[in-house]
């Protein structure tokens, strides 16, 4: 059964993907496709490495992580609800049937309907402050407690800092990690 | 146009070995996945192996793993299969079959070879 | 390894019947499905790729169906030059598998 991660409409996507290198700079290619893992290759491919770069991608597709260090989840730029559905992660280790595969299912929902805040200060103080961070399993819901007022661009550098770290300390704790050698 | 043409076939003794090619044309060979399937006297198809585009990842039936061989030179456009230990069993006409492409999305033997046929007798 | 099953094992048939073969495979394999049609001392030949698509050439009449574990291959309008063996085959798991065949024979 697939893992599943959920986004808004309007919002970018992330599929998280891992493995480790065998050797610095020692990269594996690696594929994402729209549809579930078949037995060769990743279905419709959206974006492939080589062992070297990011060597073919399509539009609103990229990889946001450092992928020299095997860190190749996927962004999706402004999904829509056509978004929604299977996706695969296919690490491409040379040998006789090593390839590993990981299929991910995207939630897509659609935009919370809000009001437009009259001003910054009646903004702050109905913000929620929590941040839903999708790990492995189900998702997880990190309450941020009292916090003084935040602008919506400190939000967004909280939340990449909090999945940065937390996200991908978890993710490979939990054994999303493909290890190389 | 798509060609592919397997030679290589022929009677061998049961415990010997053969070596079965595939010359590809009209199409980057380099781009595709590449199989080989076979069947026997009268009866159904069977995936052999398959190959990935620079001969990296191999994948193989596992009765057949530990006694057949798929490769590919690019170079040459061409596709191989090593058959050792051959059995009355692996008698059968062996196809060269071009598969999934770059991008994906064509999930099919979507071009064949007239085949080949490989008699293991005493 | 996932079997695929075909039904029926052989069919007679007229020029201008309709023809359903099934196929079934044992787990989920989503669309990753591909039909042939083998004639007697020919390699086969691609008429629908992942579950649906018809191949490059194929006639119109030709057509697929299903995803899943259950999957149709339908001739609307026989003609002489179908009447051959036609397989199933998954892409999804491996091995690759086919099923055994369904032998559409003339009435």
């Known amino acids: 059964s697939e893992v599943e991660y959920r986004a808004e409409v309007g919002q970018n996507a992330y599929l998280p993907c891992f493995y480790t290198p065998a050797a610095p700079g020692n990269l594996v290619p690696v594929c994402w496709g729209k549809g579930a893992c078949p037995v060769f290759e990743c279905g419709n491919v959206v974006l492939r490495t080589d062992e070297r770069d990011v060597n073919y991608w399509t539009s609103r597709y990229w990889l946001n992580g450092d992928f020299r260090k095997g860190d190749v989840s996927l962004t999706i730029e402004n999904v829509t609800l056509a978004d929604s559905g299977i996706y695969c992660c296919r690490i491409q280790i040379p040998g006789i049937m090593n390839d590993e595969k990981f299929n991910l299912k995207l939630v897509i929902k659609p935009a919370k309907v809000t009001p437009a805040p009259t001003r910054q200060r009646d903004f702050t103080a109905a913000f929620p402050r929590m941040l839903t961070t999708r790990g492995h399993g189900p998702a997880e819901t990190q309450t941020l407690g009292s916090l003084p007022d935040i602008n919506l661009t400190q939000i967004s550098t909280l939340a990449n800092e909090l999945r940065d770290s937390r996200l991908a300390n978890d993710l490979r704790d939990s054994g999303a990690t493909i290890r190389i050698g | 146009e798509v060609q592919l043409v397997e030679s290589g076939g022929g009677l061998v003794q049961p415990g010997g070995s053969l070596r079965l090619s595939c010359a590809a044309s009209?199409?980057?060979?380099?781009?595709?996945?590449m199989a080989w399937v076979r069947q026997a006297p009268g009866k159904g198809l069977e995936w052999v192996a398959n190959?990935?585009?620079?001969?990296?990842?191999?994948y193989y039936l596992d009765s057949l793993k530990s006694r057949f061989t798929i490769s590919r030179d690019n170079a040459k456009n061409s596709l191989y299969l090593q058959m050792n230990s051959l059995r009355a069993e692996d008698t059968a006409v062996y196809y060269c079959?071009?598969?999934?492409?770059?991008?994906?999305?064509?999930?099919?033997?979507?071009?064949w070879g007239q085949g080949t046929l490989v008699t293991v007798s005493s | 390894d996932i079997q695929m099953t075909q039904s029926p094992s052989s069919l007679s048939a007229s020029v201008g019947d309709r023809v359903t073969i099934t196929c079934r495979a044992s787990?989920?394999?989503?669309?990753?499905l591909a039909w042939y049609q083998q004639k007697p001392g020919k390699a086969p030949q691609l008429l629908v790729y992942?579950?649906?698509t018809l191949a490059e050439g194929v006639p119109s009449r030709f057509s697929g169906s299903g995803s899943g574990t259950d999957f149709t291959l339908t001739i609307s309008s026989l003609q002489p030059e179908d009447f051959a063996t036609y397989y199933c085959?998954?892409?999804?798991?491996?091995?690759?598998?086919f099923g055994q065949g369904t032998k559409l024979e003339i009435k």
């Open positions: 079959a071009r598969d999934v492409g770059y991008y994906g999305g064509n999930y099919g033997f979507a071009y």
């Open positions: 009209g199409f980057t060979f380099s781009d595709y996945y």
């Open positions: 190959i990935n585009y620079d001969g990296s990842s191999t």
């Open positions: 787990d989920n394999i989503y669309s990753y």
């Open positions: 992942n579950a649906k």
């Open positions: 085959q998954q892409h999804y798991g491996s091995p690759l598998t």
